[in-house]
Every structure is written in structure tokens, then in C-alpha cells.
Amino acid sequence: PHLRTFTDRFQTCKVQGAWPLIDNNYLNVQATNTPVLPGSAATATSKLTIIFKNFQECVDQKVYQAEMDELPAAFVDGSKNGGDKHGANSLKITEKVSGQHVEIQAKYIGTTIVVRQVGRYLTFAVRMPEEVVNAVEDWDSQGLYLCLRGCPLNQQIDFQAFHTNAEGTGARRLAAASPAPTAPETFPYETAVAKCKEKLPVEDLYYQACVFDLLTTGDVNFTLAAYYALEDVKMLHSNKDKLHLYERTRDLPG
Amino acid sequence: CKILKCNSEFWSATSGSHAPASDDTPEFCAALRSYALCTRRTARTCRGDLAYHSAVHGIEDLMSQHNCSKDGPTSQPRLRTLPPAGDSQERSDSPEICHYEKSFHKHSATPNYTHCGLFGD
């Protein structure tokens, strides 16, 4: 999947299996990623587990779990808030679109989480205070977390090797470098570009991610995944100048 | 293995009071050198763990990306505090403890928010 870290680094990762996205004293988020096609290096998120840890008189421990084709609007125990404590309503699940879009607000830690199902796969977005991100005491037992550290180098797919502004030979070179076997209905480069441009007119890294995903899988739903990911950034990111990210080698517009 | 403490200190040092520090400042290189020193200290007990190797490779990568020299000043991480997790001995009837922004405002200005996202393939 594509990862935008807390420090606004943008990476394409081939991590497979369960990896912690966030692991601090208040919250644990784990994503399970599976190959998008047999033999593919590219993976997408098929399961998300979010554990809100017991916190003072605000919330009991609550677990939220989403899987492909199962995006519940409740915690695994069936509840929609933080339990029986005095401040239980400081943790709330809201269903925005049935089976497609859920928002979890954890006011006691100033955190908002958005989980979506787009096509077969899940997307995740979070807004969290710096102090909460950094609240880790037990360094020995709390695992590596991707939102903070990014993906290990050996788990990254080099975006720039898969994207080029040029068409023709550049496009063919890009398609040849695809990390997956040829998808059943892979788009020609020009079609992928056109479909992504429709939804993502700014040629930023979300647009590039869209093109990459279409060339890799041929699945048009990934256009929506990139689109909604950017929409979630617009809603959740505190620095409005950093909504769009660009390759380091490219000049920023304006 | 305390490598994650190094990761967090680096993140702390490169997250400014309003927005993350520019990648191309001398402060960024100083923070990287501190990060490198911290990871070297964990080598013995972390050498077999992914977090350690990830950090080492990440540092090398960032050092070359930003033309940071291996020698030079290092930075001190900023210290932050937050109420302890889990059940607290101190009970309060005030709902403020369950509202981060309200309780935060008592101690300082508006909190700095960060964003992380995962999508697509």
C-alpha cells in the first residue's frame, strides 16, 4: 500500500502480513496487507485492527476490526462508544456510508480515525496530536510502527522507477517495470493517466499512486482509493500547505 | 532493545513547534547524527531486529539524500509529557480529562496535529 507518514514522507510499501501502523500508550493500530495479484510484490490492506487502550475514567479498552467486505459501525463487543465509564462518549464510532466509510473519534486523545472500504481493500487515515504519537514508554515491547518510522527500505517500492511524465517509450518502460505479473485487464498508460486525471487533477503523489495502482492491477477502484485518501488528508491534515505532496525532484507549482 | 526510543527522539527533534522542520536545514542533519549515535548504542541488543536495521538503512539513506556530513553537531530531543495511560489513582469528576483539547489548553497552546494515511497498493 501507499503510506503517508506523520512526517509527511510518502512511500509505496510491499509489506505483507500484519504490521503495526501505530503503537503507543493509548492506541494500537495494525494493518494486514495481502498481494493484490498472485505473485505480485504490490500489496493492499485487507484487514485493520484498532485497539483503544483503557484510559482513566474515560474509556474501557475497545477493539475495532475491519476486514474486506466487513466494515462494521461498532466495536467488536457491539458497542459504539467507550463503555460504561464517566467519559465514555469521548470515544465514538459514526457510520458515514454504510459498509464503506466509518469515522472514529477519540476525543480523550484528540484523535480522529477514518476507515474506508474502496473496492476490495481498506484505507486508513488518522489525525493525532504530536504528544500522543510520541507517548511510548515501554520501548522494549512496543513494536516498529509504520506511521512514525515509515517502511523499511527493503520493503519499499521505488515510486520514481514506476512513474514518468513522458509517454511512449517512457510509458512502456514503466509498464515493463511493474512489480506484478500482467494484470488480467491492465490499462494502457494513457488510459490510466486519463482515469486518474478525472479524479485527481493535481499531478501530486496521490495522482502518481493512482497511475501506479492502475498499471499494477487494472482495478479502477484504486482510482477512488487515491481520491478518498486525498479527501481524508484535506479533512485531517492540520497544515493546509502540505495537502499535496510531490516528488523531491519535481518543482513545486506556483 | 531500545531502538524505538531513538526513532521517537528523532521524530521529536524533526517536528517543529508548528510544522515539521525543513528536511534541508542544518538542524535536520544534527537530528540525523543524534539518531545515528542513538542507534549505534542499541546495536548490541537490537542487531537482530527489523527496527534496528530499518533505522540504520533509513539514516544512511537520509544522510546521503540531504548531504549531511557524518561529523558535526547533534541535537537534543524535546521532552513532552501526557497524562499516564491506564487507570489513574487520581479521580476527577471533570469531563475535561476526557477532552484532549480542553485539558491541553490548560497547559499550553493549541496542540500540534499530525496525519498518517494508508491506501491503495
Epitope: 502480513g17 522494549d140 | 532493545c1 548504542r41 548490541r44 527489523l50
Partner: antibody, heavy 115, light 112 residues
Framework: EVQLVESGGGLVQPGGSLRLSCAAS????????MNWIRQAPGKGLEWIGM????????HYADSVKGRFTISRDNSKNTLYLQMNSLRAEDTAVYYC????????WGQGTMVTVSS | DVVLTQSPLSLPVTLGQPASISCRSS???????????LEWFLQKPGQSPQLLIY???NRFSGVPDRFSGSGSGTDFTLKISRVEAEDVGVYYC?????????FGQGTKLEIK
């Protein structure tokens, strides 16, 4: 909760082979180095060896070098110890433990080498 | 190989009283970066070992504060401020500074 469950122990003749497994759960197995440690009946603990998270490096105690091989399958969250040319002095409870330096241990599996 | 020598090998203690175990190393356990990788484990009867102290003096998560570790170079000590019934078992020191990693021979703590 971290859980490590060893299996594969049993009775084997001197010169024989045995393969022990350690099934891990409750943590991201593929992130951590892992160790094997043994304890002969009524005796103290002896470190056997360790393997890096990605199998890129393995370190062994001199007493087992060339006879024992540590491996892992991260997709199965499982650590292995292949023991060949077994000797009577290899009789022990074998533990797997999480981390480059061990923090959490399994309950152990008994290996008896006897004719 | 680094040899760790523990003393005493047997330690009978009265409940509520303090206890102290010594671990002496055949060479310095200070690593090149200044850190010292000495740990203490407790093996309760019929159980697997559990980590108590790492890097000489840091209590592992969940370990009661009656346990404390100290020392440097080649001499290390584990102290229990007030022994409780659940503290019975064999205590091992362990070094991770030098390969191969080695354990002390163990100290058996029992209640008088």
C-alpha cells in the same frame, strides 16, 4: 500477549536428528531476532544461538556449531531448530525466546538423547 | 567465553527480609558504546525463565519495584528489598555484551 509454543521434542538415539518448532503469537514475529536456549535436567541455562529477523545472520554456541541449524518462516510465524548428530549431552529442555537479547520465553520442549 | 560466577548458590531467606545475589564476570561487560548488557532472570519452579532486569538496572515491564539491579564492569548485584513467597526460584545473571551469550550457574532462593 506474547506467546511462544515449542514442539517437536521427544526421544532420539545418539547420532539421530530432530527438528524443533516454536510457534509465535502476540507480537510481530517478523520484526524480531529470536533465540534458542536449553537447560539440561537439574542444570543451568545454556544459550544455543540466535537468528536475525530476516535470517540474514545466525550465531551459534561452539557446543552446537556445525550440528544445529536455526531457521525461521516469517509467513508462518515459526522458528525452527534442526538438530543433527545428537549426543547424550544434548538432552535438555529447549526454549525459544523473543528478541535479539531474550525477553519472553516459551514453556520449552524436552529432548532426550539416549540409546 | 565470558564466565559469570554467581554467589551464593543457595540463599535461604525469611519472608519480608531483604536478599542479595552477586554476579561476577571474567571480563568487563561494558560494551564499546558505554552500555553494559547484563540481565537477570528468575526461573520459578516448573516454569520457564522470566526477565526481571535488563542493562544492569532497568526493571522489565511488570516487574515489582522490590527488585533492583546495580553494578558495573565485572561486579553486579540483584537485590530484593523484601522477599515474598512468589520470589522463590532460581535466579540467573546473563550477559549479552560478548558472543557467545552466557548465563551464570544460578542462585536458588528458598524461604527459611
Amino acid at each position: 500477549e506474547v506467546q511462544l509454543v515449542e514442539s517437536g521434542g521427544g526421544l532420539v538415539q545418539p547420532g539421530g536428528s530432530l527438528r524443533l518448532s516454536c510457534a509465535a503469537s502476540g507480537f510481530t514475529f517478523s520484526n524480531y531476532g529470536m533465540n534458542w536456549i536449553r537447560q539440561a535436567p537439574g542444570k543451568g541455562l545454556e544459550w544455543i544461538g540466535m537468528i536475525y529477523y530476516d535470517s540474514s545472520e545466525k550465531h551459534y554456541a561452539d557446543s552446537v556449531k556445525g550440528r544445529f541449524t536455526i531457521s525461521r518462516d516469517n509467513s508462518k510465524n515459526t522458528l525452527y531448530l534442526q538438530m543433527n548428530s545428537l549426543r547424550a549431552e544434548d538432552t535438555a529442555v529447549y526454549y525459544c525466546a523473543k528478541g535479539t537479547t531474550p525477553d519472553y520465553w516459551g514453556q520449552g520442549t524436552m529432548v532426550t538423547v539416549s540409546s | 567465553d565470558v564466565v559469570l560466577t554467581q554467589s551464593p548458590l543457595s540463599l535461604p531467606v525469611t519472608l519480608g527480609q531483604p536478599a542479595s545475589i552477586s554476579c561476577r564476570s571474567s571480563q568487563s561487560l561494558e560494551y564499546s558504546d558505554g552500555y553494559t548488557f547484563l540481565e537477570w532472570f528468575l526461573q520459578k519452579p516448573g516454569q520457564s525463565p522470566q526477565l526481571l532486569i535488563y542493562e544492569v538496572s532497568n526493571r522489565f515491564s511488570g516487574v515489582p519495584d522490590r527488585f533492583s539491579g546495580s553494578g558495573s564492569g565485572t561486579d553486579f548485584t540483584l537485590k530484593i528489598s523484601r522477599v515474598e513467597a512468589e520470589d522463590v526460584g532460581v535466579y540467573y545473571c546473563f550477559q549479552a555484551t560478548h558472543d557467545p551469550l552466557t548465563f551464570g550457574q544460578g542462585t536458588k532462593l528458598e524461604i527459611k
